[in-house]
Interface confidence: medium
């Protein structure tokens, strides 16, 4: 499978909520012994390999935000820790995987990465990630709502096997 990032750039005003999305493409094994580990983290541009650096999102690490579920299941972070920080990650039956960030501030601007790992009988068989940028703006030039910019066809399969 691959990970697509439908949008490469999100531009939002302060105080708004935003949902960043990644999507699994291609065949997904739904066998009983196959599960998926999915998470989000912040990173920075200008690296040799995008998303190799991991930084927390609002002080929550990638492990705090992770989901782990079977290929045929939906899931979301229900724990208080994430919600107290205005965060929720979710995954549906159709391969969409998202993180919602509430009440954005300028400090939320930056590069965000989603990570999906296919686990087959204890072994992380396949590991892919996608990247997107969030710009939070304030003042008269800020949009009234979030504006999203689609990825180019090349970027929309923004895949890096680790």
């Amino acid at each position: 499978f691959k990970v697509a990032t439908p949008y490469s750039l999100y531009v939002c005003p302060e105080g708004q909520n935003v949902t960043l999305t990644c999507r699994l493409l291609g065949p997904v094994d739904k066998g009983h012994d196959v599960t998926f580990y999915k998470t989000w983290y912040r990173s920075s541009r200008g690296e040799v390999q995008t998303c190799s650096e991991r930084r927390p999102i609002r002080n929550l690490t990638f492990q705090d935000l992770h989901l782990h579920h079977g290929g045929h299941q939906a899931a979301n972070t229900s724990h208080d820790l994430a919600q107290r920080h205005g965060l929720e990650s979710a995954s549906d039956h159709h391969g969409n995987f998202s993180i919602t960030m509430r009440n954005l501030t300028l400090l939320d601007s930056g590069l965000y990465c989603c990570l999906v790992v296919e686990i087959r009988h204890h072994h992380s068989e396949h590991r892919v990630h996608g990247a997107m940028e969030l710009q939070v703006q304030t003042g008269k030039d800020a949009p009234s709502n979030c504006v999203v910019y689609p990825s180019s066809s090349q970027d929309s399969e923004n895949i890096t096997a680790a």
Epitope: T35, G70, I119, H122, S124
Partner: antibody, heavy 121, light 112 residues
Framework: QVQLVQSGAEVKKPGASVKVSCKAS????????IEWVRQAPGQGLEWIGE????????NYNEKFKGRVTMTADTSTSTAYMELRSLRSDDTAVYYC??????????????WGQGTLVTVSS | DIVMTQSPLSLPVTPGEPASISCRSS???????????LEWYLQKPGQSPQLLIY???NRFSGVPDRFSGSGSGTDFTLKISRVEAEDVGVYYC?????????FGQGTKLEIK
């Protein structure tokens, strides 16, 4: 908070069977493998086998095949390990260990407190 | 079965000094997916084992950076740069590449 609580110590005679239970709480029991590992007195750790509660899939160490059966009851979040035809060298502390996933990497993250099984005539 | 052989079996160390434990597998433990599932566990006295290192050299969350793992193929090493009193216990290497999973026989680290 994840917890694995095992049944109490057992004393058995050679040739008998023992069934050790491992009750899980604090996580989605059906989704994660449960491992069974034993430790004979003064010895190292030995992997016996594993079960994935949601599907009932099992993998056993060949050394124990034919003598061991692992089952799981998802309604009570309890895993069981039965060992038959016990011998004196089966005397050991038996641990259940629950899989945890960190950074997409599964490992033996949660351990029960251990159940001492003594085989003696 | 893959046999994991550790040495030494006993390791007396002075606090602040380095320590090194070797683990050798009887055959390659490279999994078919290219990863090497070699882990190091520490069993402190009276406790269950806890993970220190996974996939040869990755420190688990919360493990002090004085612990490091290295190696490839069949030869692996756990190093502690400066031993502290809390490091006492039995260290086990473990291979999770090929069923049956197997542990080394353990190395008992004690403070001199």
């Amino acid at each position: 908070q994840v917890q694995l609580v095992q049944s109490g110590a057992e004393v058995k005679k050679p040739g008998a069977s023992v069934k050790v239970s491992c009750k899980a709480s604090g996580y989605t029991f059906s989704r994660y493998w449960i491992e069974w590992v034993r430790q004979a007195p003064g010895q190292g750790l030995e992997w016996i086998g594993e079960i994935l509660p949601g599907s009932g899939s099992t993998n056993y160490n060949e050394k124990f095949k034919g003598r061991v059966t692992m089952t799981a009851d998802t309604s009570t979040s309890t895993a069981y390990m039965e060992l038959r035809s016990l011998r004196s060298d089966d005397t050991a502390v038996y641990y259940c260990a629950g899989e945890e996933v960190y950074d997409g990497y599964p490992w033996f993250g949660y351990w029960g407190q251990g159940t001492l099984v003594t085989v003696s005539s | 079965d893959i046999v994991m052989t550790q040495s030494p079996l006993s390791l007396p160390v002075t606090p602040g000094e380095p320590a090194s434990i070797s683990c050798r597998s009887s055959q390659s433990i490279v999994h078919s997916n290219g990863n090497t599932y070699l882990e190091w566990y520490l069993q402190k006295p009276g406790q269950s084992p806890q993970l220190l290192i996974y996939k040869v050299s990755n420190r688990f969350s919360g493990v002090p950076d004085r612990f490091s793992g290295s190696g490839s193929g069949t030869d692996f090493t756990l190093k502690i740069s400066r031993v502290e009193a809390e490091d006492v216990g039995v260290y086990y290497c473990f291979q999770g590449s090929h069923v049956p999973w197997t542990f080394g026989q353990g190395t008992k680290l004690e403070i001199k």
